[in-house]
Interface confidence: low
Amino acid sequence: EVEKTACPSGKKAREIDESLIFYKKWELEACVDAALLATQMDRVNAIPFTYEQLDVLKHKLDELYPQGYPESVIQHLGYLFLKMSPEDIRKWNVTSLETLKALLEVNKGHEMSPQVATLIDRFVKGRGQLDKDTLDTLTAFYPGYLCSLSPEELSSVPPSSIWAVRPQDLDTCDPRQLDVLYPKARLAFQNMNGSEYFVKIQSFLGGAPTEDLKALSQQNVSMDLATFMKLRTDAVLPLTVAEVQKLLGPHVEGLKAEERHRPVRDWILRQRQDDLDTLGLGLQGGIPNGYLVLDLSMQEALS
């Protein structure tokens, strides 16, 4: 704690400038008026204060705004933001996307810190949902942001925001997250024509149900094997050999290399061997000809 001492004669700060870097901590505390600091926060970034000096400046702002800083100050915090704790940030009401961008810029190049996570949380809660501009901004700074959200949190993403999502933003999403995002993507891209639609929806297909995969198989989409392998096993199982052949197009040959892996392995077990033989790929493990299949239901234990 910096002790309260009188400001030496002639040292009272009239503005925030470079001369302050030569002030000792106690001099900054005594000679810089908190209200002056608040109105000239934009200058702090241009001055190479030490971390100890920044601690003093933060302390002054905390005293001036014990209930939380106003947005006019927050927007210009610059690298003083790195001194803020999640507890500090929880007191803020950040509504401007420009403020969010300014603070994310300070942390650019680093992985998401607890401060940034709290800031984003406050911002999104303040807006009520993850709108397109916000999502665009967040994924630009943190490509994995979307996949860091729980399925419950993703439910607040409006379909319109899905336009901002790039394939790499979904790289680390698990099936539960894609289950939530896929219907939104389907809604967002519903008015696109076949080939354009497939390009956009492809990254989300890990959440697609069987009926949608059947529909895609009628559209000559030529799905690649990497996408096929990410589909939900329970969605792939009911597809016929003809439907999978149409879905994959020329990529159907890739099934052979994946025949031991899910979902291909489980799908093979559900097909008649005669039907599999029509592919000419040497896929084995189907239901022998003449067998009566009484129950094709399979319980999937997917977490």
């Epitope: 992985e111 998401m112 810190s113 607890p114 996570a117 860091s148 729980s150 419950e152 680390t172 892996h261 899910r262 234990a301 997917l302 977490s303």
Partner: antibody
Framework: EVQLVESGGGLVKPGGSLRLSCAAS????????MNWVRQAPGKCLEWVSS????????HYADSVKGRFTISRDNAKNSLNLQMNSLRAEDTAVYYC??????????WGQGTLVTVSS | QSALTQPASVSGSPGQSITISCTGS?????????VSWYQQHPGKAPKLMIS???NRPSGVSDRFSGSKSGNTASLTISGLQAEDEADYYC??????????FGCGTKLTVL
């Protein structure tokens, strides 16, 4: 550099309680799921419990369910394991480990818990 | 949840290759490509050597490789070196959102 440091181990009588902590540094703790794994002297590794980055998902091994409670404080970069109704078979070195996709990519050095009368 | 099955020990001479198997069930190893392998030297914490069946984290020698067939995963170490002598554990994520480990394989470099 990523660091995980466990503490809180020691000798405790059967039926007693202990609280283990794991202090994390060098990475954004709040972005990662964390696990506790234990290893009885000269024995196998045994997974104990996991907690997701925002504490939304918590799981326990059957052997500790109802007795152990995992928690985390993202603001303090700490992971905790509250162990109640301890038994002799809980004697082990307890490790905290970070989950990176499918593997536990960083482990602490462990803290020894001995349950004995 | 039963432990994954590993051989208690394997051995090999320097320069040779060895393979350690890890057998689980359709609820773990067979269900997910989420098998990982750890190396543990006496008195030390385990170290991740392979994740997602065959992915090597940065800093791990390319002499270590992983594969999987059905319910069995394998770790292969080629060009054995003295410092490879350690215990090796496999692990898998399971369909009940838990993790399961093998009981370890002691590798002796002759």
């Amino acid at each position: 550099e990523v660091q995980l440091v466990e503490s809180g181990g020691g000798l405790v009588k059967p039926g007693g309680s202990l609280r283990l902590s794991c202090a994390a540094s060098g990475f954004t703790f709040s972005s990662y799921s964390m696990n506790w794994v234990r290893q009885a002297p000269g024995k196998c590794l045994e997974w104990v419990s996991s907690i997701s980055s925002r504490s939304s998902y918590i799981h326990y091994a059957d052997s500790v369910k109802g007795r152990f409670t995992i928690s985390r404080d993202n603001a303090k970069n700490s992971l905790n394991l509250q162990m109640n109704s301890l038994r002799a078979e809980d004697t082990a070195v307890y490790y905290c480990a970070r989950v990176q996709r499918a593997g536990l990519d960083y482990w602490g050095q462990g803290t020894l818990v001995t349950v004995s009368s | 949840q039963s432990a994954l099955t590993q051989p208690a020990s394997v051995s090999g001479s320097p320069g040779q290759s060895i393979t350690i198997s890890c057998t689980g069930s359709s609820s773990d190893v067979g269900n997910y490509n989420l098998v990982s392998w750890y190396q543990q030297h006496p008195g030390k914490a385990p170290k991740l050597m392979i994740s997602e069946v065959s992915n090597r984290p940065s800093g791990v020698s390319d002499r270590f490789s992983g594969s999987k067939s059905g319910n069995t995963a394998s770790l292969t170490i080629s060009g054995l070196q003295a410092e490879d002598e350690a215990d090796y554990y496999c692990s898998s994520y399971t369909s009940s959102s838990t993790w399961v480990f093998g009981c370890g394989t002691k590798l002796t470099v002759l």
